[in-house]
């Protein structure tokens, strides 16, 4: 990002104000919604995303099949409260006073429940499967290069260690993409999973958080590939509480 | 070229205010940032505050908090440093220096320096 | 503030030698981090800017490294120009603070 003040963006993050008012008259961006100061020369925390999001004016069987704890975010948007390093807090509520418990990337584990619900630890989501349809195509694309495109460009855009990028199945017109990282796999610096697969999803609704870049132009072999419906589950370290209720619905 | 061009040497008496000058061409003043930096004889750089012309903001460090005030006049181009109730340890060259354009907080433009005496 | 700690104080080295200067910041501070030379009577001239990222013009025997709180610049051949006080500098947060320099001097 650049210091002269009409180029002060934040390549990685477009909900975000900039100014050269960091230290030094660095380029500093802060995330809307949070006033947060954020490193553009990585992805924003999802939890951010989401708090900026919020803050804006309103615009079947698998090939994998997904463990029984696998998450699905089916609350949708909501305003979270993120901790000071831009992570969600374990507890969330809303403004009647309706709280719950998420994992590391703000999906309700628990049932809701009142004030009094305890969440005594942030739940990480260590296995992502993002599960992918696309729009037919004259023929089925060669696996091999599908598996590399998708691994670039989660390497390329999204910064992600390609040891985070478990595998990638496909069997026509499905994709299936496995992230996974351990608290113990995550080092200082390395792209947060659930991140990655955040920007993956916005990118494929046609929402691109990068500031300015065009949006996600995927092609396999010159092949176009557009997604027609995307499902994302999420596996947490610790299986979620749910009561049987909701199970059995 | 790009470059900034500092006023000349001052001697001023303890308990006194030293005003240095800070004069930029070559690139559009309002756009980059003025930090001032100091650096006593035989000792090591000491940063002392800053300032964004376009939108007025400053920062001082601590130490100098109180004593120093950055301005900048845009039809000239020109930031300014003023110390007030100067000591013999003020005694130093005065540096003033624009943050470099990748916008890292990096200083890659710097005046040729003020050497500014405190002495009774 | 974050105090930035410079490695050695002082070193003898001749023309030709390779040469390599740490930094140590007192927190992190990401990769907000510059490396100067500065001549006696003369302004700091940078050469380093975000920790690895060259300055236009500065010849390419300076490379820096390093991210959070150790930091290195190296000098793979040592011309006569750059016998000379070294400074890194960090901009992660206010105030801007300096290291302690380091003086490089002729074996």
């Known amino acids: 990002h650049t210091a002269a003040q009409d180029n002060c963006t934040c390549p990685t993050n477009k909900m975000t104000v900039c100014s050269p008012d960091g230290p030094g008259g660095r380029c500093q961006c802060r995330a809307l919604g949070s006033g947060m100061a954020v490193d553009c020369s990585t992805l924003t925390s999802k939890c951010l995303l989401l708090k900026a999001r919020m803050s804006a004016p309103k615009n079947a069987r698998t090939l994998v099949r997904p463990s029984e704890h696998a998450l699905v975010d089916n609350d949708g948007l909501y305003d979270p409260d993120c901790d000071p390093e831009g992570r969600f807090k374990a507890r969330q509520c809303n403004q009647t006073s309706v709280c719950w418990c998420v994992n590391s990337v703000g999906v309700r584990r628990t049932d809701k429940g009142d004030l009094s619900l305890r969440c005594d630890e942030l739940v990480r989501t260590h296995h992502i499967l993002i599960d992918l349809r696309h729009r037919p195509t004259a023929g089925a694309f060669n696996h091999s290069d599908l598996d590399a495109e998708l691994r670039r460009l989660f390497r390329e855009r999204y910064r992600l260690h390609p040891k985070f990028v478990a595998a990638v199945h496909y069997e026509q017109p499905t994709i299936q993409i496995e992230l996974r990282q351990n608290t113990s796999q995550k080092a200082a610096g390395d792209v947060d999973i659930g991140d990655a697969a955040y920007y993956f999803e916005r990118d494929i609704k046609g929402e691109s958080l990068f500031q300015g870049r065009g949006g996600l132009d995927l092609r396999v072999r010159g092949e176009p590939l557009q997604v027609e419906r995307t499902l994302i589950y999420y596996l947490d370290e610790i299986p979620p509480k749910f009561s049987m209720k909701r199970l059995t619905a | 070229q790009v470059q900034l061009v500092q006023s000349g040497a001052e001697v001023k008496k303890p308990g006194a205010s030293v005003k240095v000058s800070c004069k930029a061409s070559?690139?559009?003043?309002?756009?980059?940032?003025i930090n001032w930096v100091r650096q006593a004889t035989g000792r090591g750089l000491e940063w002392m505050g800053w300032?964004?012309?376009?939108?007025?903001?400053?920062g001082y460090a601590q130490k100098f908090q109180g004593r120093v005030t950055i301005t900048a006049d845009e039809s000239t181009s020109t930031a300014y440093m003023e110390l007030s109730s100067l000591r013999s340890e003020d005694t130093a060259v005065y540096y003033c220096?624009?943050?470099?354009?990748?916008?890292?907080?990096?200083?890659?433009?710097w005046g040729q320096g003020t050497m500014v005496t405190v002495s009774s | 503030d974050i105090q930035l700690t410079q490695s050695p104080s002082s070193v003898s080295a001749s023309v030709g030698d390779r040469v390599t200067i740490t930094c140590r910041a007192s927190?992190?501070?990401?990769?907000?981090l510059a490396w100067y030379r500065q001549k006696p009577g003369k302004a700091p001239k940078l050469l380093i800017y975000r920790a690895r990222s060259l300055q236009s013009g500065v010849p390419s025997r300076f490379s820096g490294s390093g991210s959070g709180t150790d930091f290195t610049l190296t000098i793979s051949s040592l011309q006569p120009e750059d016998f000379a006080t070294y400074y890194c500098q960090q901009a992660n947060s206010f105030p801007v603070t300096f290291g302690q320099g380091t003086r490089l001097e002729i074996k």
């Open positions: 070559g690139y559009t003043f309002t756009n980059y940032g």
């Open positions: 220096a624009r943050p470099n354009t990748g916008g890292d907080g990096a200083f890659d433009i």
């Open positions: 300032m964004n012309p376009r939108s007025g903001n400053t």
């Open positions: 927190q992190g501070i990401k990769s907000w």
